[in-house]
Interface confidence: medium
Amino acid sequence: AILGRSETQECLFFNANWERDRTNQTGVEPCYGDKDKRRHCFATWKNISGSIEIVKQGCWLDDINCYDRTDCIEKKDSPEVYFCCCEGNMCNEKFSYFPEMEVTQPTSNPVTPKP
């Protein structure tokens, strides 16, 4: 591992569409990829009238947008579906929404999904 970088070897896995996609609904996913590539975790979710509905969580391939992010934070302002990625084992276990354009308090607290 490179000093100062969290290497991702596994991520929390969740798939709301598990029956159609023929996967487990939830679990831990080992992350694979070429040795010269970085690996990340991701989470996607919806906020329906203040209720958090997780869509997917799992491993994410080498993506510059995820580099050196130890926390999974969506910064896009009011997306239809929220997405965040991060580096470090199981770093997608918790995810948050902190819109970049706002300097007020976050609109939602960090979320810890229930299995």
């Epitope: 159609r20 996609d21 023929r22 992350c31 694979y32 799992g58 491993c59 994410w60 391939l61 947008n65």
Partner: antibody, heavy 120, light 107 residues
Framework: EVQLLESGGGLVQPGGSLRLSCAAS????????MNWVRQAPGKGLEWVAG????????SYADSVKGRFTISRDNSKNTLYLQMNSLRAEDTAVYYC?????????????WGQGTLVTVSS | DIQMTQSPSSLSASVGDRVTITCRAS??????VNWYQQKPGKAPKLVIY???SRASGVPSRFSGSGSGTDFTLTISSLQPEDFATYYC?????????FGGGTKVEIK
């Protein structure tokens, strides 16, 4: 170097069977999900089937469900596609392709393909 | 199933031109889109994954953008070796689905 080599294609009559193989090398085969994608002559790409790293999960396109079976032998670094009840519309070049995870990732390496022709 | 609609189906361009290909998904697929290049008689080759990330060995003139339902592949300065057919593909849900392809031809 990652290499995927398909074999087993050929001419078969409608209703017949064929088994395609894809020999993998240059990577840890047992860590990757694998897929079959086909391309009819002069047409676009169509995903056919996928299998996760240990064979525990498989999924199929509606067009081949119940007729095709994807499987793998990690001890031989080989992916298979058993094709039964073949139809003229199954005529295509069949490619095997690797993906890092069961779904939600790209097909990052492809074989050169093997041609399946279904005709009487 | 998620439909991927690609446009245009073909285009003619000259070396040095900036080329843009678009792909629209029938529902939001976040950043779960990939782009492939295919030359006649050859296997497809991954160019862009996760909407914006360039695959290994792909020149910097190739870039991807978009999220949700609308995606773009851009070649900033077309080179002779770039004349090929390009496909978008969604990996948000199974079954994996591809766009119909865009053939980039020499003007």
């Amino acid at each position: 170097e990652v290499q995927l080599l398909e074999s087993g294609g050929g001419l078969v009559q409608p209703g017949g069977s064929l088994r395609l193989s894809c020999a993998a090398s240059g990577f840890t085969f047992s860590s990757y999900s694998m897929n079959w994608v086909r391309q009819a002559p002069g047409k676009g790409l169509e995903w056919v089937a996928g299998i996760n790293y240990n064979g525990g999960y498989t999924s199929y396109a509606d067009s081949v469900k119940g007729r095709f079976t994807i499987s793998r032998d990690n001890s031989k670094n080989t992916l298979y596609l058993q094709m039964n009840s073949l139809r003229a519309e199954d005529t295509a070049v069949y490619y095997c392709a690797r993906s890092a995870n069961w779904h939600d990732t790209a097909l990052d390496y492809w074989g050169q393909g093997t041609l399946v022709t279904v005709s009487s | 199933d998620i439909q991927m609609t690609q446009s245009p189906s073909s285009l003619s361009a000259s070396v040095g031109d900036r080329v843009t290909i678009t792909c629209r998904a029938s529902q939001s697929i976040l950043s779960f889109v990939n782009w492939y290049q295919q030359k006649p008689g050859k296997a497809p080759k991954l160019v862009i994954y996760a909407a914006t990330s360039r695959a290994s060995g792909v020149p910097s003139r190739f870039s991807g953008s978009g999220s949700g339902t609308d995606f773009t592949l851009t070649i900033s300065s077309l080179q002779p070796e770039d004349f090929a057919t390009y496909y978008c593909q969604q990996s948000y849900n199974l079954p994996l689905t591809f766009g119909g392809g865009t053939k980039v031809e020499i003007k």
